[in-house]
């Protein structure tokens, strides 16, 4: 659909005569009739197949025709057509004399014709005005013409319908050739598809309007490129939704079981070495001079009673010092200047001379010791507690404080690792020499049967239209991640596509 526009510019009829040569009285009051028709190999009389238009009287004899409107008529003249413009045409322009006010063909005498032109033309849509001039012996007509498309019609032949829109069915304007030009933020054949936020993950994100990034189930983050881990996952991550892959040192279904107490809590003090020995269990190996479960106790070097013969021990920064009683000397007061005559043996100890009376030895009654029977026996000296148990003096007796996993008077008994039911989800526990082993029931795995490897809900391929399936470990169900253009719990429904359009 388009318009053939004809601009009449100038008509010259200096002598003011008709085609017959007869003069007009008083002058030639001139109007025009225009006939536009299909291209003919030889221009021939016949119907004006592309349309006709007439002007009012535009002037007398010779005159220039003003642009826009002249005496109520339009200039350029408009000859609309509602078909594909063929590119060629035949044009007939007649100049007539109007003796009166009635310009109808039947009201005019046949000899009122002033002049007539008939041409064959070729004209592309949108071309600049084409100027032409037709001269006869008596008249001259200067005119120009062009073809433009009607609103919403485009292309070389005005045959492409395109109406700009910005609604559910499209967001575009029209290019000169009738192709769509999407508005910023839209794409697709009909510019219906929003361009999501730059970087929005192709599969895991989508949008309903430009520069948006909405995440599909199981994904999060500004660009929907971060998976959502299993609900309740504490110290774990995921690479696909609903996973809970434990960080180093953590275990269990939710990665909330501490398998690396040493690293996470640093329980050993004073530079002791920490060793993990099970869930929330550890052993501290103390540096010399320290003791206690966490090596938190500083050992006094005097605690081992190094001073003999009643010498008193004094702690010093770099060791200890023995203050010897009279008659004794040496680092540990081990040398005596006494003999049995000096009654050196305490607590009922009996003295025996040695080396011809130059020295002596005390034989101590039970519960006493020392070179002069001056010390009460420390029942912990022999380190009777096994398996790292701590020995405690309790008056005449002693007792052992055992480390976790050991029991008995001397901590000589290994408590069964299985006693505290360490195997999760009904796993069977087996005691081993250096720990335990869990035999897991179907659907679970891991050192303590803490990892759920439940029946894969995705195994039956429940998702349609090439959707991605994810298993929700907490419910043993699946979630379908739909590709663009599909919805539904199984992505089984296509998003309603718009009706087809003629362009």
């Amino acid at each position: 659909s388009g318009v053939f526009q004809l601009q009449l510019q100038e008509f010259i009829n200096e002598r003011g005569v008709l085609a017959s040569g007869r003069p007009c009285e008083p002058g030639c009051r001139t109007f025009f009739r225009v006939c536009l028709k299909h291209f003919q190999a030889v221009v021939s009389p016949g119907p004006c197949t592309f349309g006709t238009v007439s002007t009012p009287v535009l002037g007398t004899n010779s005159f220039a025709v003003r642009d826009d409107s002249s005496g109520g008529g339009r200039n350029p003249l408009q000859l609309p057509f509602n078909f594909t413009w063929p590119g060629t045409f035949s044009l007939i322009i007649e100049a007539w004399h109007a003796p009166g006010d009635d310009l109808r063909p039947e009201a005019l005498p046949p000899d009122a014709l002033i002049s007539k032109i008939a041409i064959q033309g070729s004209l592309a849509v949108g071309q600049n005005w084409l100027l032409d001039e037709q001269t006869s012996t008596l008249t001259r007509l200067r005119y120009s013409y062009r073809v433009i498309c009607s609103d919403n019609y485009y292309g070389d032949n005005c045959s492409r319908l395109c109406k700009k829109r910005n609604d559910h069915f499209g967001h575009y304007v029209c290019q000169p050739d009738g192709n769509l030009s999407c508005l910023p933020g839209w794409t697709g054949e009909y510019c219906q598809q929003p361009i999501c936020l730059s970087g929005c993950h192709e599969q895991n994100g989508y949008c309903s309007k430009p520069a948006e990034c909405l995440c599909r189930p199981g994904w999060q983050g500004r660009l929907c490129n971060e998976c959502i881990p299993h609900n309740g996952c504490r110290h774990g991550t995921c690479s696909t939704p609903w996973q809970c892959t434990c960080d180093e040192g953590w275990g269990g279904l939710f990665c909330d079981q501490d398998l690396n107490y040493c690293t996470h809590h640093s329980p050993c003090k004073n530079g002791a070495t920490c060793s993990n020995s099970g869930q929330r269990s550890y052993t501290c190996t103390c540096r010399p001079g320290y003791t206690g479960v966490d090596c938190e106790l500083e050992l006094s070097e005097c605690d081992s009673n190094p001073c003999r013969n009643g010498g008193s021990c004094k702690d010093q920064e770099d060791g200890y010092h023995c203050l010897c009683p009279p008659g004794y000397y040496g680092l540990h007061c081990e040398h005596s200047t006494l003999s049995c005559a000096d009654s050196p043996c305490f607590n009922g100890g009996s003295c025996r001379e040695r080396n011809q009376g130059a020295n002596y030895a005390c034989e101590c009654p039970p519960n006493f010791t020392g070179s002069n029977c001056e010390k009460k026996v420390d029942r912990c000296t022999s380190n009777p507690c096994a398996n790292g148990g701590q020995c405690l003096n309790r008056g005449p007796s002693r007792m052992c404080r055992c480390r976790p996993g050991f029991t008995g008077t001397y901590c000589e008994l290994h408590v069964s690792d299985c006693a505290r039911n360490p195997c999760a989800h009904g796993g069977t526990c087996h005691d081993l020499e250096n720990g335990l082993m869990c035999t897991c029931p179907a659907g679970f795995s891991g050192r303590r049967c803490e990892v759920r490897t439940s029946i894969d809900a995705c195994a039956s391929s429940p998702c349609f239209n090439r959707a991605t399936c994810y298993t929700d470990l907490s419910t043993d169900t699946f979630v379908c991640n739909c590709p663009y253009g599909f919805v539904g719990s199984r992505c089984e429904f296509p998003v309603g596509l718009p009706p087809s359009f003629p362009w």
Partner: antibody, heavy 118, light 107 residues
């Protein structure tokens, strides 16, 4: 008096060229589409080429397309037919004509003979 | 291309006879048809155009009729000067095509 006078015909060998001219007088040459028509000895009339009044449109019969060129010089009131790669079957009397039946115009020249022979 | 089939190819008639020549187009030519008279050594002469319009200066014994694909030239009363070859020409589309001609001879 309306006159169309063809010239340039003659005997030519196959493969050679000729240029026909048609001089117009007695009418407004620039107003009309012009035609070349030929008649081979003992045969009927055959249209050859067309050019519109301003020279913007040209048409040719298939057998001469690419070999013949129609042109016009409105300032000299002259129509031309450049004929290249001539063949024996191009032998004919060539007429120029101004045809516009809408205006009752039908002017023909007297014809010029073109003979293509070795 | 539009084919023009003219008949008869030759015709013998006497002065005063009424003669009819026909042309059939291979498709609708919308009355864009002319009839020409051609004598040896002479240029074609237009008799009828637009199927039925008599060219200025042509005797009224010549008439044309028809539409669509079928057209007729009638000479109501043959005169001695009418013995010639007659051609139809379609001016609807390029290539322009002529009928094969009808040679009108004296009986």
């Amino acid at each position: 008096e309306v006159q169309l006078v063809e010239s340039g015909g003659g005997v030519v060998q196959p493969g050679r060229s000729l240029r026909l001219s048609c001089a117009a007088s007695g009418f407004t040459f620039s107003n009309y589409g012009m035609y070349w028509v030929r008649q081979a000895p003992g045969k009927g009339l055959e249209w050859v080429a067309f050019i519109s009044h301003g020279g913007g449109i040209t048409y040719y019969r298939d057998s001469v397309k690419g070999r013949f060129t129609i042109s016009r010089d409105n300032s000299k009131n002259t129509l031309y037919l450049q004929m290249n790669s001539l063949r024996a079957e191009d032998t004919a009397v060539y007429y120029c004509a101004a045809l516009n039946w809408e205006l009752g115009i039908d002017y023909w020249g007297q014809g010029t003979m073109v003979t293509v022979s070795s | 291309d539009i084919q023009m089939t003219q008949s008869p190819s030759s015709l013998s008639a006497s002065v005063g006879d009424r003669v009819t020549i026909t042309c059939r187009a291979s498709e609708d030519i919308y009355s864009n048809l002319a009839w020409y008279q051609k004598k040896p050594g002479k240029s074609p002469k237009l008799l009828i155009y637009a199927a039925n319009r008599l060219q200025d200066g042509v005797p009224s014994r010549f008439s044309g009729s028809g539409s669509g694909t079928d057209y007729t030239l009638t000479i109501s009363s043959l005169q001695p000067e009418d013995f010639a070859t007659y051609f139809c020409l379609q001016g609807s589309k390029f290539p322009l095509t002529f009928g094969q001609g009808t040679k009108l001879e004296i009986k």
